[in-house]
Interface confidence: medium
């Protein structure tokens, strides 16, 4: 009893690992929310309507002292930083199109703005944030950026943005409806990091009693089992799957979209965080506000053959 058996050592190692994961998850990821662009390319015929969408991922605080600034603008693909240039969309600046609201609210730009310019930006309480453009023309082609700023108290702003391309086509080569191309798998992995961290937190909390019980029972059983049994059980333990979590479909889809198949994304690994200052001390903007829930989007990795949807 003095020396731990192989199973005891293995189960404690497994238990410790899960417990460490739980602790890390409970403390929460350092990075806050991220922005996902479910589709990186929209190809539409002239005259069609399209809704470009961004989604908030990860833990979004809905407290009374947290507000969101969200907006859209056109940009160009900079060599260093995409979305650095802020150009108007149909003569409306990012200030004109911005939403500014609490984390628990939905919001949209006023109706007269939409009617006058064929534009409307909207945000729902599920983290979806979109701009609808009506009666597309060739001039609408270009890079579009969504910007989201989480504003906490007076001294903290956290800014993230997403980019997508719109190609408006005319003539016989143009599609009859808009076709959307999901973001690449690498992009998907990057933007789901926040969702995975949140998922790990939830799973950790839910599984903690189970883990502790499992470890305790296995420890008890281990002292009464033979070496052959230990080896067999140890190999079984190695086969335990990591607890998974379902990806919820978007609550508010693209109005004009007819999705042919549900998009699903299984994360193979959790990539390291990279990119823009995610948690900031204080900050000020050339940008936007909106709301959001903790939201796990379903995203599709792009396989070797082009993967697209008609919308």
């Amino acid at each position: 009893m003095g020396v731990p058996t192989a199973l005891e050592a293995g189960s404690w190692r497994w238990g410790s690992l899960l417990f460490a994961l739980f602790l890390a998850a409970s403390l929460g990821p350092v990075a806050a929310f991220k922005v996902a662009t479910p589709y990186s390319l929209y190809v539409c015929p002239e005259g069609q309507n399209v809704t470009l969408t961004c989604r908030l991922l990860g833990p979004v605080d809905k407290g009374h002292d947290v507000t969101f600034y969200k907006t859209w603008y056109r940009s160009s693909r900079g060599e260093v930083q995409t979305c650095s240039e802020r150009r108007p969309i149909r003569n409306l600046t990012f200030q004109d199109l911005h939403l500014h609201h609490g984390g628990h609210q939905a919001a949209n730009t006023s109706h007269d703005l939409a009617q006058r310019h064929g534009l409307e930006s909207a945000s729902d309480h599920h983290g979806n944030f979109s701009i609808t453009m009506r009666n597309l023309t060739l001039l609408d082609s270009g890079l579009y950026c969504c910007l989201v700023v989480e504003i906490r108290h007076h001294h903290s702003e956290h800014r993230v943005h997403g980019a997508m391309e719109l190609q408006v086509q005319t003539g016989k080569d143009a599609p009859s409806n808009c076709v959307v191309y999901p973001s690449s798998s690498q992009d998907s992995e990057n933007i789901t990091a926040a969702a995975l961290a949140t998922g790990a937190c939830i799973v950790g909390i839910l599984c903690l009693p189970l883990i502790l019980l499992l470890v305790y029972k296995q420890r008890q059983a281990a002292s009464n089992r033979r070496a052959q049994e230990l080896v067999r059980m140890d190999s079984n333990i190695q086969g335990i799957e990591n607890p998974g979590f379902e990806a919820s479909p978007p609550a508010q889809g693209i109005p004009e979209a007819k999705v042919r198949h549900p998009l699903s994304y299984v994360a193979q690994r959790q990539p390291s965080e990279s990119g823009r200052h995610l948690l900031s001390e204080p900050s000020t903007p050339l940008s936007p506000p909106g709301p959001g829930d903790v939201f796990f989007p379903s995203l599709d990795p792009v396989p070797d053959s082009p993967n697209f949807e008609v919308i």
Epitope: C83, R86, E157, R159, H277, S283, P285, L286
Partner: antibody
Framework: QVQLQQSGAELVRPGASVTLSCKAS????????MHWVKQTPVHGLEWIGA????????AYNQKFKGKATLTADKSSSTAYMELRSLTSEDSAVYYC????????????WGQGTSVTVSS | DVVMTHTPLSLPVSLGDQASISCRSS???????????LHWYLQKPGQSPKLLIY???NRFSGVPDRFSGSGSGTDFTLKISRVEAEDLGLYFC?????????FGGGTKLEIK
């Protein structure tokens, strides 16, 4: 606490250029836009433009396009404004201000830099 | 550009009195998203402006509760319930609904 430290007063000749600096401290420089404001007794306060220090993206008041150029150095948390082809109309106090989204306003201001254009 | 107009240009008061400063904009400051981005600043002699009130009626951090803002559309008011010596200076209204952001010429609060 948030502080914006601006460079000292400038006396410059007409036609010349001048670069004003604004060093930020007490917050994460790249998280907030830096805006610049001109103040004269005649025209009061006028918004010149803004820069996003993270991306280098800028926005200008049409009135100051061609007159002012905004830049930022992330490594030193310093914003710069170059004023060129100076005339007596450009004599003013220039403020750098931090723009914050919650108030959607300029929440902290530098102490100002006085620029005098005189031959 | 949106023009911001103050009344009065000068307001002599006695310490302890209530002061009321008005600001009118040349067009509505209600943004497409429903918010009204009208702010008040105080500039004391020889100092830079300081934010007092944002979005019509919200006091910025550290601002005493004797300051209050109200109004809608194009007409706005800043009230100081009991004027103290440290309140003297130039009060500006400012809008950030329409680009370019613009400021009023200011109201000078001085001792009667």
């Amino acid at each position: 606490q948030v502080q914006l430290q601006q460079s000292g007063a400038e006396l410059v000749r007409p036609g010349a250029s001048v670069t004003l600096s604004c060093k930020a401290s007490g917050y994460t420089f790249t998280d907030y836009e830096m805006h610049w404001v001109k103040q004269t007794p005649v025209h009061g306060l006028e918004w010149i433009g803004a820069i996003d220090p993270e991306t280098g993206g800028t926005a200008y008041n049409q009135k100051f396009k061609g007159k002012a150029t905004l830049t930022a150095d992330k490594s030193s948390s310093t914003a710069y404004m170059e004023l060129r082809s100076l005339t007596s109309e450009d004599s003013a106090v220039y403020y750098c201000t931090r723009w914050s989204l919650r108030p959607y306003a300029m929440d902290y201001w530098g102490q100002g830099t006085s620029v005098t254009v005189s031959s | 550009d949106v023009v911001m107009t103050h009344t009065p240009l000068s307001l002599p008061v006695s310490l302890g009195d209530q002061a009321s400063i008005s600001c009118r904009s040349s067009q509505s400051l209600v943004h497409n998203n429903g918010n009204t981005y009208l702010h008040w600043y105080l500039q004391k002699p020889g100092q830079s402006p300081k934010l007092l009130i944002y979005k019509v009626s919200n006091r910025f951090s550290g601002v005493p509760d004797r300051f209050s803002g109200s109004g809608s559309g194009t007409d706005f008011t800043l009230k100081i319930s009991r004027v103290e010596a440290e309140d003297l200076g130039l009060y500006f209204c400012s809008q950030s609904t329409h680009v370019p952001w613009t400021f009023g010429g200011g109201t000078k609060l001085e001792i009667k």
